[in-house]
Interface confidence: medium
């Protein structure tokens, strides 16, 4: 049984009757094929469900799809397939839902081989009505909305053309040919790479990076010899081929590609890769692959310009380009990230950082837990978390770690307790303090989700047998109640709740199997009557994030400030509600050396907070490439960590002298860059 399933747990009164009155079944009149579900807008209650069924015939594949719509969070569905003229929708493109609450939806249809172009169905009223539009091209990718204006769409065609629409897909214009990759930037800017000779693959490393800020009226070449590019936070990154050999380096721009600087990162060879693990407006986490087929690399964290990098974590597990990494941003607490390292003996271990990559440690062993067979010392071991890599290896791990920004401090994950990740069946663990301490929450693998900003946690056992029981907790996973939501068990396929964890509705998806047919079925449970009343002031308590030593005046200081949160008490059974806003009170900390990273040419010896000169650069003038010029750096070795808000205390001074010499960079310098207009 789950921890807490005993007489000592406070039971939620009459919950069976309350949930039974709020459990809604919907059987879909479909043969079981595939099903995809999308939420349209925020707090609208609108869900679109697309079911598709393929019948492989001898010469061709016959397909059928149906579209359903709910406007009450999944309690009831209406078949709206006739709104899209009973057309077969291509599932590989999914449902393209517009940003924010635009209410826009684009569905891409399957068309017959000889047609001039593709076909889309467009809705701008939360899928109440659809307009059919025939395209002048066959789409290669899903339609991409501009984050700033949902009327602006871009798509790549199967002929590698870049197509743009300014009126939400009604009219399309090809703005460029021979395009490999295109992305929206800020302010409706489009960045894209083009090939000159044969194809995207043949020209890899010889691509050009272009920018248009006016939807294709004019263009600017902002880079050459490009391998690939990426956007993260306010940074634009490009990996650029070196002149002399087959290596490439990362260049970074913070002004949309007008000026570039070479990132102080190792170059990589043909078989290696760079990967932006996470980025915000302050900094970036960059993974640099090791040479050879090692399956690991190094994480570097950037300064505020994205130029100077500090080594953050060695032997970081990342299998191949586009492969698996366990790197996870714990969104429920600032500065916290979890990932896996590959140790010398090829075992995989979990590491956590609480200060945005400054220091990494093992996860603390949960109280009242035993070390498993992987542990050399039965009393000393750590918690190891299963994430993407374990899932890719087909371990019995149904879900990756879960955290939500509005469920402060809560992290839920599958894990094992030992010296490394175990291949044995995992249990589910929870942290209520952003990863500092952990408790076993459920025995064995489960699906889980957070509702009402943490007021309810819902879980379903991962089983190959049909299920009919859901578990829920109103006290952050300490005590669990079980509810039988149907008499007839179903083959479970997934839990669905509205993104953002503010909803009190959960949908359980699965299928029933009878002798002749199988059908999709969903059960939507509304927990509103379990949380009968709205939370009041007395239901919240104050919690200091990152607290490790109450005696220390600087307790809770991370990146130069501490934050006190109002958190729901575990014993309060009440609704945070859809409008719940996290209440936090920040206070600035005094600066210490911990608030500074080591500048270019400096490093921190292990277990030391002081930055010392790199021996090979001692006594040399420090020269590095900045905005296409060589800079002379006069520094005492420190630079403020991006996003750090500390004031007073220690204050190392630094200055940069400009030598105004050209860098030997193979990147286009600004004055060489060309522009052209259509």
């Amino acid at each position: 049984s789950a921890p807490g399933e005993d007489e000592e747990c406070g039971r939620v009164r009459d919950f069976v009757a309350k949930l039974a009155n709020n459990t809604h079944q919907h059987v879909f009149d479909d043969l079981r094929g595939s099903v995809s579900l999308s939420w349209v807008g925020d707090s609208t209650g609108v869900i679109l469900v697309l079911t598709t069924f393929h019948v492989p015939l001898v010469i061709m594949t016959f397909g059928q799809s149906k579209l359903y719509r709910s406007e009450d969070y999944g309690k009831n569905f209406k078949d709206i397939t006739d709104l899209i003229n009973n057309t077969f929708i291509r599932t590989e493109f999914g449902m393209a839902i517009g940003p924010e609450n635009s209410g826009k939806v684009v569905l891409t249809a399957e068309v017959s081989g000889g047609s001039r172009g593709g076909r889309i169905f467009r809705s701008s009223d939360f899928a109440k009505n659809f307009v059919q539009t025939d395209l002048p091209f066959h789409p290669l990718t899903q339609m991409m909305y501009s984050p700033q204006n949902s009327d602006y769409l871009l798509a790549l065609s199967t002929e590698n053309g870049l197509w743009v629409s300014k009126n939400f897909g009604g009219k399309w214009e090809e703005i460029h040919k021979a395009v490999c990759l295109a992305k929206w930037g800020s302010d409706n800017t489009i960045f894209f790479t083009t090939y000159a000779n044969g194809s995207c693959k043949a020209d890899l490393g010889a691509l050009e990076l272009w920018r248009t800020s006016d939807l294709g009226k004019s263009f600017k070449t902002i880079g050459v010899k490009i391998y690939s590019f990426g956007l993260g936070g306010r940074f634009l990154f490009a990996s650029v081929m070196a002149d002399k050999d087959t290596t490439r380096r990362i260049h970074v721009s913070t002004d949309q590609g007008d000026t570039w600087s070479m990132a102080q990162l190792p170059s990589v060879g043909q078989e290696q890769f760079y990967s932006i693990l996470a980025a915000n407006d302050d900094m970036v986490f960059m993974h640099v692959d090791e040479p050879g087929d090692t399956g690991f690399g190094t994480i570097f964290t950037s300064d505020d310009r994205g130029i100077v990098y500090s080594k953050s974590l060695d032997r970081h597990l990342y299998t191949t380009t586009g492969g698996e990494t366990d790197f996870t941003n714990v969104t429920s607490l600032r500065g916290v990230y979890i990932t896996s390292v590959l140790s010398e003996d090829n075992s995989i271990q979990t590491m956590i950082t609480f200060d945005q990559g400054g220091r990494w440690t093992h996860l603390r062993k949960p109280e009242n837990s035993e070390c498993d067979a992987t542990a050399k010392n039965k009393n000393e071991c750590s918690l190891h978390i299963h994430a993407s890599y374990s899932i890719s290896q087909k371990l019995n791990v149904p879900m990756a770690p879960l955290s939500e920004p509005n469920a402060v401090g809560i992290v839920i994950a599958h894990g094992s307790v030992g010296d490394a990740i175990s291949v044995m069946v995992p249990d589910v663990y929870i942290s209520d303090d952003g990863g500092y301490s952990w408790t076993k929450m459920l025995e064995g693998p489960h699906y889980y989700t957070i509702l009402d900003s943490g007021g309810i946690i819902v879980a379903i056992e991962h089983s190959s047998r049909p299920i009919n029981v859901i578990k829920f907790s109103t006290d952050e996973g300490q005590c669990w109640q079980t509810y039988t939501f149907t008499r007839d068990p179903i083959y479970f396929t997934g839990l669905a709740s509205e993104p953002g964890a503010r909803s009190m509705n959960i949908s359980i998806w699965g299928f029933t199997e009878s002798f002749l047919t199988s059908q999709w079925v969903s059960y939507t449970i509304d927990f509103k009557d379990i949380l009968e009343r709205n939370c009041e002031e007395k239901d919240y308590t104050i919690w200091l994030a990152h607290s490790t030593d109450p005696e220390d005046y600087e307790d809770g200081c991370i990146l130069g400030y501490k934050e006190q949160f109002l958190r729901l008490r575990k014993s309060s059974v009440c609704q945070n509600g859809r409008d719940y806003v996290v209440t936090k009170q920040p206070s600035i900390c005094l600066c210490s050396l911990e608030d500074f990273l080591c500048d270019f040419g400096y490093y921190r010896p292990e277990n030391d907070s002081k930055c010392v000169e790199q021996p090979e650069l001692k006594g040399h003038d420090l020269e590095f490439c900045l905005y296409g010029r060589e800079e002379h750096l006069t520094t005492n070795g420190y630079r403020k960590i991006p996003g750090d808000k500390c004031q007073g205390g220690v204050n190392p001074v630094r200055e940069v002298k400009d030598l105004k010499k050209k860098c030997t960079s193979n990147f286009l310098s600004p004055e060489k860059q060309n522009s052209k207009s259509n």
Partner: antibody, heavy 124, light 107 residues
Amino acid sequence: QVQLVQSGAEVKKPGASVKVSCKASGYTFVAYYMHWVRQAPGQGLEWMGWINPNSGATRYAQKFQGRVTMTRDTSISTAYMELSRLRSDDTAVYYCARGKRSSGWYEGYGMDVWGQGTTVTVSS
Amino acid sequence: DIQMTQSPSSLSASVGDRVTITCRASQSISSYLNWYQQKPGKAPKLLIYAASSLQSGVPSRFSGSGSGTDFTLTISSLQPEDFATYYCQQSDVSPITFGGGTKVEIK
């Protein structure tokens, strides 16, 4: 060592106010809540409220709302509790007590250090 | 407000006896329960916090258990210095409330 030293005994007339001080030493004053608890002669313990010395935020028991004011002076690590419109049934020993903390949580772990108590007598 | 009911209100015991005091909350308080000892003319002293954690410096003969609504303080072998009044206190929901106390006297 960690200690809380309270001001001396007070005798007050009904309708008057009393202000009790509690000086903390041996620990970081702003890092712990300060609770105030009273005990009438021969009776049990009654919680009055707390103050967060770091922010100055307070929470009072409903019974004392409007009559009690808790303040602090971080420069001298001292907390104060003022009770106004005194009645004879306010005669009690008044204690300040430090709230125990654990992993960031300010409440829920009891009161681990107590002052020696201040006797307040309300009599006409 | 959450009512805390302690029983018994008083008990007589001898040195070496095993003593059990119970405390019941009017609604679930998870494990936010603390136990105090108070001797005449002195301030209370924290013995057990979070239902079962022993406060540092408190002898191991004191132990606490329970969760939800029912809690127990146990003194495994009563010592002469243990004769005092014991209070339970919930710190889960404002206002914080105390039990009425249990006076442990010499038989």
